[in-house]
Amino acid sequence: AGVFELQIHSFGPGPGPGAPRSPCSARLPCRLFFRVCLKPGLSEEAAESPCALGAALSARGPVYTEQPGAPAPDLPLPDGLLQVPFRDAWPGTFSFIIETWREELGDQIGGPAWSLLARVAGRRRLAAGGPWARDIQRAGAWELRFSYRARCEPPAVGTACTRLCRPRSAPSRCGPGLRPCAPLEDECEAPLVCRAGCSPEHGFCEQPGECRCLEGWTGPLCTVPVSTSSCLSPRGPSSATTGCLVPGPGPCDGNPCANGGSCSETPRSFECTCPRGFYGLRCEVSGVTCADGPCFNGGLCVGGADPDSAYICHCPPGFQGSNCEKRVDRCSLQPCRNGGLCLDLGHALRCRCRAGFAGPRCEHDLDDCAGRACANGGTCVEGGGAHRCSCALGFGGRDCRERADPCAARPCAHGGRCYAHFSGLVCACAPGYMGARCEFPVHPDGASALPAAPPGLRPGDPQRYL
C-alpha cells in the first residue's frame, strides 16, 4: 500500500509563437483545477478507460481575472498535492493522464460551468520510495510543469511497497532469514507476502508465497467454499474418508470488485472490501462528493455532501460516463433519417439532408412536386426525394419538354413497321399478324388468336388497333 503524489508547479503558455488566450476574462472570471488518472503498466489505453490505479481531483485554485491587454501569464494554481492512494503493490511502470480544467464563475444558470483546457498523458517507470521526478508536458500552446513520486505507507517498504518491516529485536542484527529494512536500518524486513491473489478474507500466510485457508475454504487462493452436502457415505475401500470437498462456483469468481477491491463471499452473495477512496457494492464509486466537482464537461452533480453519500452526474448532451468524461459519438445512433449525413459539431448535432428532405433530422419529406410543372400535359409524380414527370404521349424528358420519337423503342412486333402519328404511333403489321403492336398471329383459316373481337368487329376483318 502507498500513495502516488503529484505536485503541479505551473500551468501557462508554452514557449514559442502562438501564445494562447487567457482562459479567464473580466466578464468571465475563472479558476483552475486538475484531475490525475493512473493506470498500471505502459498502456496505450484511451483516456476513457478506467483509472485502474486510481484517480484524484485537486482543490480549486484562486479566482483569476484577465488583465486587459496583458499576455496570458502562468495561471494561479490550487494549493497542495494530488494524492492517489494505491492498496496493493506499486507496479513500477504506469501511465498517467493529467487534465487541466477551467471552472467559469460567471452568471451561469445552474451553477459553474466546467471545460477541459488541456490534457497531457505519458508513460513512465518509477520506483516507490524514490525522490521526486520532475516533468514538463505540452498540450497545444499550454505547458504544464509538475513533479511526482510514489511512497509506501507503513509498514510497507521497497520499490513496490510489498515488503513489510518490524523493529529489530536485537540492536545489532535481524533474526534468522531477515534482512535490514533499507532505508529503515533500525527495522528488519518481514517477508510476509502471501501468494499473489490469496483471499484476504479466507487466507493467510506464515511463509512467503503461501496461502493457507480458513477452515471451510479451499483452492490455491482460498476462494472456493467447501461443500460437504454431496459427500458419499464412507463405505468400502474409502472407509477412512470422513467427508469430501466439492468446490462450487463462488460469487467471487472473477472478482466482481473494481478498483482493487477484494471480494468475500456472504451466505447470499458477496461483499467487496474497498480500498481507501472507493465504495459502493463493487467499489465502483470513488469517495468524492459534489463538493469536489467530479462531473466534467458541464455535468450537473447531484448527491450528498458527506463522504458516505454517493453522487450522480447528469451529463449534458454529447457526454456520458459516470463523470461525464466520455464524448458520445452521437452519429453512431444514426439520428439523421432518409439517408441524411450526420455531423457532430461538439456543441450540436447537424443533419445534412438529401434532396427532397428537410428538418433537424431530415424527417420531413418535402412536396417534391411543389412549384414544379411538367410541360405538355405531363403529370408530376412524387417519390424518393425527387420529382418525376409522367409525360403525355409524344413527349419525354425530365419535364416532358422533349418531343419523343414514339418509334425509337421499336414497339411493333413481328416485323411490323412503325409510323409516328399525332395521337401516338401506328403499326403496319406484316402479313399474318394483327393488333396495336402486331402482337397477335392471324390463323390460316381466318380466325385470329384474339380471345374476343372488340364490339362491332368480326374476326378476320382488316383493321388497325391504335
Epitope: 500500500a1 492498496r87 496493493d88 503493490a89 505507507e153 507503513p154 509498514p155 510497507a156 510489498t162 513489510l164 518490524r166 518481514a190 510476509l192 507476502v193 502471501c194 501468494r195 499473489a196 491473489g197 490469496c198 484476504p200 478474507e201 487466507g203 493467510f204 500466510c205 477484494s262 468475500s264 456472504t266 461483499e271 467487496c272 472490501t273 474497498c274 480500498p275 481507501r276
Partner: nanobody
Framework: QVQLVESGGGSVQPGGSLRLSCAAS????????MGWYRQVPGKPRELVAT???????NYATSVKGRFTISRDNAKNTVYLQMNSLRPEDTAVYYC???????????WAQGTQVTVSS
C-alpha cells in the same frame, strides 16, 4: 512501526466465555481485513475468523455460531467474543490482518486461552 497487542486471554471452564481484544498502533486499519488466528503447540497456525472493513465476517467451521468477531475502527481495535468454549479451543490466539497480498504485521506475542475443567 506497526504493533498489534492481544489481550483478554485466560483460563475458563468448558461452556464458559472470554472476550479477546487486539489493539493496533502505527497504522490506520479501517480498510484492512482483520483476523483472529490460533495455534496449538506442534500444530500449524489456523485462521479462526476474519472481518472486512465493511463488517462482513467469516468463521472457521469449527467455531461458527460460538465465536463472534467485531471491530471498532475509531479505536483501531478488533475483538473476538468466544462463547460455549470447548477444550479443543485451547490455544495461543493471535491477531493480524491482510493488506493486499501481504500480512499486515509480524505475528505478535499472542494471548493464551485455556479451556479445561
Amino acid at each position: 512501526q506497526v504493533q498489534l497487542v492481544e489481550s483478554g486471554g485466560g483460563s475458563v471452564q468448558p461452556g464458559g466465555s472470554l472476550r479477546l481484544s487486539c489493539a493496533a498502533s502505527g497504522i490506520v486499519f479501517n480498510s484492512d481485513v482483520m483476523g483472529w488466528y490460533r495455534q496449538v503447540p506442534g500444530k500449524p497456525r489456523e485462521l479462526v475468523a476474519t472481518i472486512t472493513g465493511g463488517g462482513s465476517t467469516n468463521y472457521a467451521t469449527s467455531v461458527k455460531g460460538r465465536f463472534t468477531i467485531s471491530r471498532d475502527n475509531a479505536k483501531n481495535t478488533v475483538y473476538l467474543q468466544m462463547n460455549s468454549l470447548r477444550p479443543e479451543d485451547t490455544a495461543v490466539y493471535y491477531c493480524n490482518g491482510r493488506r493486499g497480498d501481504s500480512m499486515l504485521a509480524f505475528w505478535a506475542q499472542g494471548t493464551q486461552v485455556t479451556v479445561s475443567s
